[in-house]
């Protein structure tokens, strides 16, 4: 049989937010120079099944043979190293696998540097040590797709050793990247080996190579962008938040509301009150009091901190969040304890994570 | 060991002009993409302006952009900020720092010079 | 621009406590974030680069952790010197940005 090793990352993400959107990153595929490899296009009810690598069709060769939902890669080389994806075209509809095949013998995936005094950072390589290009920081290039909403910046980068030093140039669809090739253009940062493009359009789809070479060889690795629109939705609490708190008397609290909006929200916090001892007016409708909402003289709307608070702090605190869409609101309940019966926990300041988007 | 001395700060009137420099020792310079960083009285960090080692990336914050300018001299060792049609709201503490390798993290600050813009 | 969300903005402790400050990004910056310190009169010191790892010389009570949009700054144990303003910094988008930093007072 075909030799390879399968990585699988098996590390759990936290679910994404609403305004975020994720391919799932593909499977690994490693082998080593002269090894053989094959890979089962893991798509169900595929009629017709086409393989692409980088983004460009793959067709069967010398070294590639492509049988059913199989395809074996023989007497593999650094330069079979990429992002494949096969498609499963099917009466009506298509569906596509991504995986990533890395050919190496030697892959440095550490820190780039140690650091362990604080003068200089890095030692240059020995001017007689010649080098061909290499992957200085693998860990770094471990995300191959990259989704995006629109609007945002991407990153890519392509952190690379040699001697002589490398450089580096990048590639959109496997053409020269030009300036010119999207408004606004494009940075890239040499020292952080990086490509930088702000406020992505759907135009910027598509693939991006960077290729690292010197007079002893070449080595690239290619990005795939896909550029999601954004559809404006109402706002969008996290679950759990605000969470009920207890304090004692003369005690601080904090309440924290955490939204999801791409359209610009509103952030109100209200607490039902009493009026001449009643909760509710003669319309029927609650007395409610706007503790705090967002705007100019108001930094931090989406968190509520009470200070030495009393027994009358009691009771519930309300998240209310608008947009031009519609809103949502979430509730606590702060209960307020007598000194004696303070709450039994260790002692920690923490401030929840908050976000307006 | 990294050292980063700052000066040129001074008042000047608005629409005024300053010219800031950084001395830099204890390492090898144009090794090192410099930044300038200031910070308004009592308000916190603002990032101006970054130079990478060969001068080939610039970049502004957009509050300053137009207006000043960045450089350096590696045979001197010395970060620039050339400042023109200041404003009052320019007035703030401006640091110079340097970037760690591969990264942007501004591992090692000068003391800082004060710019007063004021009629 | 990305925005950086720092909470709490001050926030009183004591000798002892573990305090955690925490820094949003207004959109996914994979782990380009620093923490620093500033006190009073003084220049800041880096205390945590790319998100999680401690800079030489800054003390283990210190770490760092956070990928995306969601960082965290936690000191396990605080000590005398602590006391002072912590900043979040990104540096994904070419147009870096602070938080609006955290006061960490004597309680």
């Known amino acids: 049989r075909p030799s390879f090793s399968l990585v699988e990352d098996t590390t759990l993400e936290p679910e994404e937010p609403p305004t975020k959107y994720q391919i799932s990153q593909p499977e690994v595929y490693v082998a080593a120079p002269g090894e053989s490899l094959e890979v089962r296009c893991l798509l169900k009810d595929a009629a017709v099944i086409s393989w692409t690598k980088d983004g460009v069709h793959l067709g069967p060769n010398n070294r590639t043979v492509l049988i059913g939902e199989y395809l074996q890669i023989k007497g593999a080389t650094p330069r079979d190293s990429g992002l494949y994806a096969c498609t499963a075209s099917r009466t009506v509809d298509s569906e596509t696998w991504y995986f990533m095949v890395n050919v190496t013998d030697a892959i440095s995936s550490g820190d780039d540097e140690d650091d362990t005094d604080g003068a200089e950072d890095f030692v240059s390589e020995n001017s007689n040590n010649k080098r061909a290009p290499y992957w200085t920081n693998t860990e770094k290039m471990e995300k191959r797709l990259h989704a995006v909403p629109a609007a945002n910046t991407v990153k890519f980068r392509c952190p690379a050793g040699g001697n002589p030093m490398p450089t580096m140039r990048w590639l959109k669809n496997g053409k020269e990247f030009k300036q010119e090739h999207r408004i606004g253009g494009y940075k890239v940062r040499n020292q952080h080996w990086s490509l930088i493009m702000e406020s992505v359009v759907p135009s910027d789809k598509g693939n991006y190579t960077c290729v690292v070479e010197n007079e002893y060889g070449s080595i690239n690795h290619t990005y795939h962008l896909d550029v999601v629109e954004r559809s404006p939705h109402r706002p969008i609490l996290q679950a759990g938040l605000p969470a009920n708190a207890s304090t004692v008397v003369g005690g601080d609290v904090e309440f924290v509301c955490k939204v999801y909006s791409d359209a610009q929200p509103h952030i109100q916090w209200i607490k039902h009150v009493e009026k001449n001892g009643s909760k509710y007016g003669p319309d029927g409708l609650p007395y409610l009091k706007v503790l705090k909402h967002s705007g100019i003289n108001s930094s931090n709307a989406e968190v509520l901190a009470l200070f030495n608070v009393t027994e009358a702090d009691a009771g519930e605190y309300i998240c209310k969040v608008s947009n031009y869409i519609g809103q949502a609101n979430q509730s606590a309940w702060l209960t307020v304890l007598p000194k004696q019966q303070a709450p039994g926990r260790e002692k920690e300041i923490t401030a929840s994570p908050d976000y307006l988007e | 060991q990294v050292q980063l001395l700052e000066s040129g700060g001074g008042l000047v009137q608005p629409g005024g002009s300053l010219r800031l420099s950084c001395a830099a020792s204890?390492?090898?310079?144009?090794?090192?993409?410099m930044s300038w960083v200031r910070q308004a009285p009592g308000k916190g960090l603002e990032w101006v302006s970054t130079?990478?080692?060969?001068?080939?990336?610039?970049e502004y914050a957009d509050s300053v952009k137009g207006r000043f300018t960045i450089s350096r001299d590696n045979s001197k060792n010395t970060l620039y900020l050339q400042m023109n049609s200041l404003r009052a709201e320019d007035t703030a503490v401006y640091y110079c720092?340097?970037?760690?390798?591969?990264?942007?993290?501004?591992?090692?600050w000068g003391q800082g010079t004060l710019v007063t813009v004021s009629s | 621009d990305i925005q950086m969300t720092q909470s709490p903005s001050s926030l009183s402790a004591s000798v002892g406590d573990r305090v955690t400050i925490t820094c949003r990004a207004s959109?996914?910056?994979?782990?380009?974030l620093n923490w620093y310190q500033q006190k009073p009169g003084k220049a800041p010191k880096l205390l945590i680069y790319d998100a999680s790892n401690l800079q030489s010389g800054v003390p283990s009570r210190f770490s760092g952790s956070g990928s995306g949009t969601d960082f965290t700054l936690t000191i396990s144990s605080l000590q005398p010197e602590d006391f002072a303003t912590y900043y979040c910094h990104q540096w994904y988008s070419t147009l870096y940005t602070f938080g609006q930093g955290t006061k960490v007072e004597i309680k």
């Open positions: 130079i990478e080692g060969d001068s080939n990336y610039i």
């Open positions: 720092a340097r970037e760690r390798t591969y990264s942007s993290a501004f591992d090692y």
């Open positions: 959109q996914d910056i994979s782990s380009d």
């Open positions: 204890g390492f090898t310079f144009s090794d090192y993409a």
